[in-house]
């Protein structure tokens, strides 16, 4: 425990001290006091440097003194023979004796008292920056007017921090400007403007005089500007060394003025103002800015419009323009958006046609649609060439964005029919000669494909079976062949309204309006063995004359068999109706006069016994198109006859073209349109 005073005596004092002794005393007085140690008696064996016996006084790491020998007071009024004054509150006294004493020595008597120290004067380092005040047991620092004592209780500074400037314009100066600024101060000024405005600082060279840098170039007093993560300065010296206009690019600025204890100058004065935060005029390719300005600042809004053929894609939505706002951080909103070339995407595929994979699907690219020739052609024109337009659509000069339509080429057989090995009444044929030929298996009959969805046949073929099974693409109707061919599934059968339905069809004598249409569930794919026949035109060019030749085909009865295995065909001339009337009906089911002959019927045959027969019904009587010799049209449909191998009667298709077209239009599907 610290004490204010005390006594220290050598061992056995006042008797002689023993040999070989080492003893120490730790003196401690309260904080803020020094120690006054004085000896009133000293009788210790004398030796050079007190090497044998000694009393040693140590303060910290410093030896304050080492004593031996005899001393007596010089002052008759004072008993003190030796004294020490230390400005510290701790002291150590160490007594040592060696192994022998030539005489009898009595040692020492000493006393210590706590004494006040003057911190203001007793030390090399002055404890206070300005005024030092001593008192018993301590000291305190004080400051001149307008200064305040810092938290360390030693340093004085001016109260120059804490000011926050929020006005859009202002002036700030160092304390006492233009008088010398206070030493040993740290002044912090804060400028806080509304977001979207940047602080711009302006100084004049002559308004700045701050203690210059040392030889190493370090400012002793300094002015620093801090804006976010950017720093301007430190600045010092005579005349402002930095830029006279500082654009901080921030709405918040901290000004820090740091001074040391020496070298005060007049200081500095600055002006600041808030500029709306500028946003850079960015180069956004393929676009136009509206309004166009030399400089854009906070809250400015521009509309960025893409040039034709370019679009801004955000998510999955494409737009031709977007708005961008100059934000408070000096950056444009929507800055990620860019005008990219319009992408028309992979072109849609078309039925029965193709489009080459484009090298590019971007604005300006060109693609070409083609139809699967020679079985399909482009119905709606336009040449099939499309370019990627500015609106993101593939556009054709004629059709616009409408896709081309590939429709079957009609009436063109892949191989022309030639009457080769002669068979009585007809020839073997290949389905490629008559690709429109449709086979009905129940009843055994024929039909003619007129487009992807429709089969034309005789009414008497379908009147008893409204769900006929049909096949296309096979020359042979053997089971193994039909299994490989295309089976057609009917959706609906349309019998001509003029066809009279009978309770006993076997006794029919009236075959007027013997025509029907079968709508298919699925479109037929055309190719070398499957292709439609054309319909007759409505002009007089399509009026048949006696002697005009037509082709018939089918799997009907031949001389040898009831049903042909392979397709048979014959070339027949048109004959006057009376020729058909004159032939005696082979197995009449009624009086010969009861059989009806009308202008809706064509009579043909009579040459070399070539004729259609049972099982050929519904097949086409195909005549060369008068306006296009490469094509055939269905002039007639095998209907009935008085006797096989003579003349036959065919439904005159030209008389039914309007009904055919109307029925097909009224019963088309959106897919077909």
């Amino acid at each position: 425990e610290p004490t204010m005073y005390g006594e220290i005596l050598s061992p056995n004092y006042p008797q002689a001290y023993p040999s070989e002794v080492e003893k120490s005393w730790d003196i401690e007085v309260p904080e803020g006091y020094g120690i006054h140690l004085y000896f009133t008696h000293l009788d210790i064996e004398l030796s050079e440097n007190c090497a044998y016996d000694s009393v040693q006084i140590i303060s910290g790491d410093t030896e304050e003194g080492r004593l031996c020998g005899q001393r007596s007071s010089n002052n008759p009024h004072s008993p003190i023979v030796e004294e020490f004054q230390v400005p510290y509150n701790k002291l150590q006294v160490i007594f040592k004796s060696d192994f022998s004493n030539e005489e009898r020595f009595t040692g020492f008597a000493a006393y210590y008292v706590a004494t006040d120290i003057n911190e203001c004067t007793d030390f090399v380092d002055v404890p206070c920056s300005h005024f030092c005040n001593n008192f018993i047991g301590g000291y305190f620092c004080s400051c001149p007017p307008e200064y305040f004592l810092h938290d360390d209780m030693k340093n004085c500074g001016v109260n120059c921090s804490g000011d926050v400037f929020t006005a859009l314009i202002g002036e700030i100066a160092s304390p006492n400007y233009p008088k010398p600024y206070p030493e040993n101060s740290r002044c912090e000024y804060q400028i806080r403007l509304e977001k979207g405005f940047q602080v711009v600082v302006t100084l004049r060279r002559e308004d700045f005089d701050v203690e210059a840098a040392d030889s190493a170039g370090n400012c002793l007093d300094s002015l620093v500007f801090v804006a976010g993560d950017r720093q301007f300065g430190p600045y010092c010296g005579h005349g402002f060394p930095g830029p006279l206009n500082i654009e901080t690019k921030s709405n918040a600025l901290d000004i820090i003025f740091q001074t040391d204890l020496t070298g005060q100058k007049k200081g500095w004065k600055l002006r600041y103002h808030g500029d709306p935060m500028p946003c850079p005029k960015e180069d956004t390719p393929n676009s136009v800015w509206e309004p166009a300005k030399a400089k854009y600042v906070f809250r400015d809004v521009v509309q960025i419009t893409c040039l034709d053929g370019f679009e801004v894609v955000e998510g999955r939505v494409g737009a031709t323009s977007f708005y961008s706002t100059c934000q408070s951080n000096g950056k444009w909103s929507n800055s990620k958006l860019k005008c990219q070339p319009v992408d028309c995407g992979i072109p849609e595929s078309i039925e029965n046609g193709k489009v080459e994979d484009p090298e590019s699907t971007l604005f300006g690219s060109v693609i070409r649609y083609t139809c699967e020739e020679p079985y399909y052609y482009m119905e709606n024109g336009g040449g099939g060439e499309y370019h990627c337009a500015g609106n993101g659509s593939w556009v054709n000069e004629v059709l616009g964005p409408e896709l081309p339509k590939c429709v079957p080429v009609c009436g063109v057989p892949r191989e022309p029919f030639e009457e080769k090995q002669r068979i009585i009444g007809g020839s073997d044929a290949d389905i490629k000669n008559f690709p429109w030929q449709v086979f009905f298996d129940n009843p055994w009959a024929g039909g003619a494909l007129i487009n992807e969805y429709w089969v034309l046949t005789a009414a008497h073929v379908v009147e008893g079976n409204r769900e006929p099974t049909m096949y296309v693409g096979s020359t042979s109707v053997q089971t193994s062949r039909l299994a490989k061919s295309k089976m057609l599934t009917p959706e609906h059968v349309f019998i001509h309204p003029g066809w009279k339905l009978l309770e006993v069809p076997e006794g029919r004598t009236n075959f007027d309006n013997d025509i029907a249409l079968v709508r298919l569930k699925d479109p037929v794919k055309m190719g070398p063995t499957v292709s439609p026949i054309c319909l007759p035109g409505t002009s007089s060019d399509y009026n048949l004359m006696d002697g005009d030749l037509g082709l018939i085909s089918g799997w009907g009865r031949t001389e040898k068999r009831d049903r042909a295995v392979r397709l048979k065909a014959a070339r027949l001339p048109v004959a006057p109706l009376r020729k058909c009337k004159e032939v005696k009906v082979e197995k009449p089911t009624a009086d010969a006069e009861a059989y009806v002959f009308t202008p809706n019927m064509i009579c043909a045959g009579g040459e070399k016994g070539m004729d259609s027969c049972k099982g050929d019904s519904g097949g086409a009587f195909a005549v060369q198109d008068p306006n296009d010799k490469t094509k055939f049209y269905a002039a007639g449909l095998v209907s009935w006859g008085p006797q096989c191998g003579t003349y036959g009667l065919y439904t005159r298709v030209k008389n039914y073209v309007d009904w055919i077209m109307k029925t097909m239009q009224e019963n088309s599907t959106p897919r077909e349109d």
């Epitope: 298996d441 020359t475 042979s476 109707v477 089971t479 193994s480 299994a483 295995v565």
Partner: antibody, heavy 119, light 107 residues
Framework: QVQLVQSGAEVKKPGASVKVSCKVS????????MHWVRQAPGKGLEWMGT????????IYAQKFQGRVTMTEDTSTDTAYMELSSLRSEDTAVYYC????????????WGQGTLVTVSS | DIQMTQSPSTLSASVGDRVTITCRAS??????LAWYQQKPGKAPKLLIY???SLESGVPSRFSGSGSGTEFTLTISSLQPDDFATYYC?????????FGQGTKVEIK
């Protein structure tokens, strides 16, 4: 009326060959597709092959490939089926059959020829 | 090759019973399937063609159904003349394979 008349029964030793004929009457062979079917005693029916006039090729069942040969003589309207490397399991009644039309598998069947393979 | 699997192999039934025989194809054969009846020592007789079409002259108690891979032959009321072996056959593509047969015998 179409008829198929087959050659008579045969007895053959293992490893030998047999050639069965089938004569068409009432029609021409060129108009028909001839198939061959066999049936071992107490066993099921096995399709052996046919001549496909459309493709102009003979199609053999995988099981008989390499051992069977089917030929036609259109001048006599006769079809032939030759089976070589005979083994006891080839003992069967062999039928020639004409292919039917429009879904009918077989139209006319021959009376069958019994081939017995025995050592 | 398309495999045809018939079930059951043997079926014991009485006169007047309703009998169903199943035929399964290893892949789709659409409707290209035929059913035959065969009696000992005789050539097979066609009953049904194109899966469901009845051959002319065949009694209406015989009927066929199915398409794709699953087919059935039904005899609505078994008659004494119907005890025989029945075969299915696919004619969709070569090889024209037969089922292994179903023997219908008197219970």
């Amino acid at each position: 009326q179409v008829q198929l008349v087959q050659s008579g029964a045969e007895v053959k030793k293992p490893g030998a060959s047999v050639k069965v004929s089938c004569k068409v009457s009432g029609d021409t062979l060129t108009e028909l597709s001839m198939h061959w079917v066999r049936q071992a005693p107490g066993k099921g029916l096995e399709w052996m092959g046919t001549f496909d006039p459309e493709e102009g090729e003979t199609i053999y069942a995988q099981k008989f490939q390499g051992r069977v040969t089917m030929t036609e003589d259109t001048s006599t309207d006769t079809a032939y089926m030759e089976l070589s490397s005979l083994r006891s399991e080839d003992t069967a009644v062999y039928y020639c059959v004409t292919e039917g039309l429009a879904g009918f598998p077989f139209d006319i069947w021959g009376q069958g020829t019994l081939v017995t393979v025995s050592s | 090759d398309i495999q045809m699997t018939q079930s059951p192999s043997t079926l014991s039934a009485s006169v007047g019973d309703r009998v169903t025989i199943t035929c399964r194809a290893s892949q789709s054969i659409s409707s290209w399937l035929a059913w035959y009846q065969q009696k000992p020592g005789k050539a097979p007789k066609l009953l049904i063609y194109k899966a469901s079409s009845l051959e002319s002259g065949v009694p209406s108690r015989f009927s066929g159904s199915g398409s794709g891979t699953e087919f059935t032959l039904t005899i609505s009321s078994l008659q004494p003349d119907d005890f025989a072996t029945y075969y299915c056959q696919q004619v969709n593509s070569y090889d024209w394979t037969f089922g292994q047969g179903t023997k219908v015998e008197i219970k």
